[in-house]
Interface confidence: low
């Protein structure tokens, strides 16, 4: 139903706390360089205005759209051009072009320092002094670094953060209580960020239809007892929610997500038997829980997929009558039978099925032509299964750090032109797939591995789009989303690459490395490894292992030495010489 005042409607639906949080996230995602205080001031002004509209919906400007209200606020910021350059040109446009312009200026890799966590005592002091401001800082810092973070889910993580601080700040040993818990939240939030970015990429590049197909597959796997109409309704609603969030309409997105959670909990009987524990939780936890609820038990008596989609004499007639619905039922039926497949794989199979019908239904004897389609799925299924087996075996043999290094070598050989920091970030993220997925039961490995890799590779593509340097990467990134991962996996050494000349300073280290946290030490070593591969793209695994072992030994020796500086300055050049010889 239409509301006289959209802002009053959203304020009433969401409540003040969530309203303010979402407006802060929206502003932080649009203007990523502004300080927390600047944004907090704008949020307060918008909230005060919303309250006047709640009191009187006919008050001046209350009938304006949210885009108009928010855009006007952002465009009134002083020194916009000085701080944001051409983004200021957006303010010369009218809605909806102005909002589209803001969206296009979102930066996936803003030049902001890494979000450093204060030490425990300081964190607890500022949390106790003003929990609201503390959580506001958290929302602001995460949102500006992740401009497509799923806003209602960020509110959930802030709530988790709040609960952890409330609990741990009351303990004697705050540090050992906070560190593992906050690390856990950070890891989950980072994964959530890349997954959501993938959804927004799907929506931006291929439209709602592509996202809806993804949703149908995912929901059918999770709710195999729900009928097709139910899955279609959920997929349509989920598409709307994600479209809104990806489009910067965060208040509508959060409101509609809450509505969807409410609907699911009111219709558990026709959706899934696994929803009750989620539905007993408060709103943010409920929606989060529903988004990762375990798969319902598959119906025992599902007929073979071939009956309706291969053996039926009217396959071509049914396809011609309503292509999208027929393909949708195929995707639904196949997905509900295969919770052990990745969504990417299911979409590749649906695409193959569609291509087969397009070709065969134009022939003289269609059934003879499409009769083998299910057998033709086999190579498409085997490829990711082999990928999972090979990579999980390697992970089990090498551990996470060693596995990251193996991936780093592989990807540097595939795309040596890509900047070393991007390669290291990608390899570290790709390497985490081992810890995340390879420890799961067999039937959960494939969906975990492939869908996670696809999300990480989407980020590689986004970063590469800003400064394209590798034809290999451009080729894989310009195809469809579901073909990206197989494309990257199939890449081999880039034969066109002219190796980098050997620069001694790239491999020169100083004693300050000794005091770095373990993660930072690893990044330094991995940076050196990528540079070695760029120097010798065809170096064997043995050669690289020799050099890296020597390097590790050198660091260990010098960091234990009484006079570290002297050790580094005398042993460093020897290490460089040995490296050159080993790779000659």
């Amino acid at each position: 139903e239409a509301h006289k005042s959209e802002i009053a409607h959203r304020y009433n639906d969401l409540g003040e706390q969530h309203f303010k949080g979402l407006v802060l996230i929206a502003f932080s995602q649009y203007l990523q360089k502004c300080s927390y205080d600047e944004h907090a001031k704008l949020v307060q002004e918008v909230t005060d205005f919303a309250k006047t509209c709640v009191a009187d919906e006919s008050a001046a400007n209350c009938d304006k759209s949210l885009h108009t209200l928010f855009g006007d606020k952002l465009c009134a910021i002083p020194n916009l051009r000085e701080n944001y350059g051409e983004l200021a040109d957006c303010c010369t446009k009218q809605e909806p072009e102005r909002n589209e312009c803001f969206l296009q200026h979102k930066d996936d890799n803003p030049s902001l320092p890494p979000f450093e966590r204060p030490e425990a005592e300081a964190m607890c002091t500022s949390f106790k002094e003003n929990p609201t401001t503390f959580m506001g800082h958290y929302l602001h810092e995460v949102a500006r670094r992740h401009p497509y973070f799923y806003a209602p889910e960020l509110l959930y993580y802030a709530e988790q953060y709040n609960e952890i601080l409330t609990q741990c700040c009351a303990e004697a040993d705050k540090e050992s209580c906070l560190t593992p818990k906050l690390d856990g939240v950070k890891e989950k939030a980072l994964v959530s960020s890349v997954r959501q970015r993938m959804k927004c990429s799907s929506m931006q590049k291929f439209g709602e239809r592509a996202f809806k197909a993804w949703a149908v597959a995912r929901l059918s796997q999770t709710f195999p007892n729900a009928d097709f109409a139910e899955i279609t309704k959920l997929a349509t609603d989920l598409t709307k929610v994600n479209k809104e969030c990806c489009h910067g309409d965060l208040l509508e997105c959060a409101d509609d997500r809450a509505e969807l959670a409410k609907y699911m909990c009111e219709n558990q009987a026709t959706i899934s038997s696994k929803l009750q524990t989620c539905c007993d939780k408060p709103l943010l936890k409920k929606a989060h829980c529903l988004s990762e609820v375990e798969h319902d038990t598959m119906p025992a008596d599902l007929p073979a997929i071939a009956a309706d989609f291969v053996e039926d004499q009217e396959v071509c007639k049914n396809y011609a009558e309503a292509k999208d619905v027929f393909l949708g039922t195929f995707l639904y039926e196949y997905s509900r039978r295969h919770p052990d497949y990745s969504v990417s794989l299911l979409l590749r199979l649906a695409k193959k099925y569609e291509a087969t019908l397009e070709k065969c239904c134009a022939e003289a004897n269609p059934p003879a032509c499409y009769g083998t389609v299910l057998a033709e799925f086999q190579p498409l299924v085997e490829e990711p299964k082999n990928l999972v087996k090979t990579n999980c075996d390697l992970y089990e043999k090498l551990g996470e750090y060693g596995f990251q290094n193996a991936i780093l070598v592989r990807y540097t050989q595939k795309a040596p032109q890509v900047s070393t920091p991007t390669l290291v970030e990608a390899a570290r993220n790709l390497g985490r797939v081992g810890t995340k997925c390879c420890t799961l039961p067999e039937d959960q490995r494939l969906p975990c591995v492939e869908d996670y890799l696809s999300a990480i590779l989407n980020r590689v593509c986004l970063l590469h789009e800003k400064t394209p340097v590798s034809e290999h990467v451009t080729k894989c990134c310009s195809g469809s989303l579901v073909e990206r991962r197989p494309c990257f996996s199939a890449l081999t050494v880039d034969e066109t690459y002219v190796p980098k000349e050997f620069k001694a300073e790239t491999f020169t280290f100083h004693s300050d490395i000794c005091t770095l946290p373990e993660k930072e030490k690893q990044i330094k070593k991995q940076t050196a490894l990528a540079e070695l591969v760029k120097h010798k793209p065809k170096a064997t695994a043995e050669q690289l292992k020799t050099v890296m072992d020597d390097f590790a030994q050198f660091l260990d020796t010098c960091c234990k030495a009484a006079d570290k500086d002297t050790c580094f300055s005398t042993e460093g050049p020897n290490l460089v010489t040995r490296c050159k010889d080993a790779l000659a």
Epitope: D227, F228, K233, T270, D308, T329
Partner: nanobody, 115 residues
Framework: EVQLLESGGGLVQPGGSLRLSCAAS????????MSWVRQAPGKGPEWVSS????????LYADSVKGRFTISRDNSKNTLYLQMNSLRPEDTAVYYC????????SSQGTLVTVSS
């Protein structure tokens, strides 16, 4: 797009009969079991009857057993509900759904049983 359109409702005296129809489009009708569900004013949805895709299997709620008959014509993509010996407590909005779903994806048709 999946569409379901019910018709045939109306005002009828206790003991009277009505035949409801549900025209389906946008999906492979014969591949899916179908159901009739009703919702009385101020109450939650109540499952009435279901029929398998081929029409060979039927199920009824105890409250309508022996009085209502569900059937389908796959050549016309249409589902039917023949309602005999109607009672005042059968007053409700009747709607058809795909499978055994209780969730509404159509307008429904109002049946009022009153003298």
């Amino acid at each position: 797009e999946v569409q379901l359109l019910e018709s045939g409702g109306g005002l009828v005296q206790p003991g009277g009969s009505l035949r409801l129809s549900c025209a389906a489009s946008g999906f492979t009708f014969r591949s899916f079991g179908m159901s009739w569900v009703r919702q009385a004013p101020g109450k939650g949805p109540e499952w009435v009857s279901s029929i398998s895709g081929s029409g060979s299997d039927t199920l009824y709620a105890d409250s309508v057993k022996g009085r209502f008959t569900i059937s389908r014509d796959n050549s016309k993509n249409t589902l039917y509900l023949q309602m005999n010996s109607l009672r005042p407590e059968d007053t409700a909005v009747y709607y058809c759904t795909i499978g055994g779903s209780l969730s509404r994806s159509s307008q429904g048709t109002l049946v009022t049983v009153s003298s």
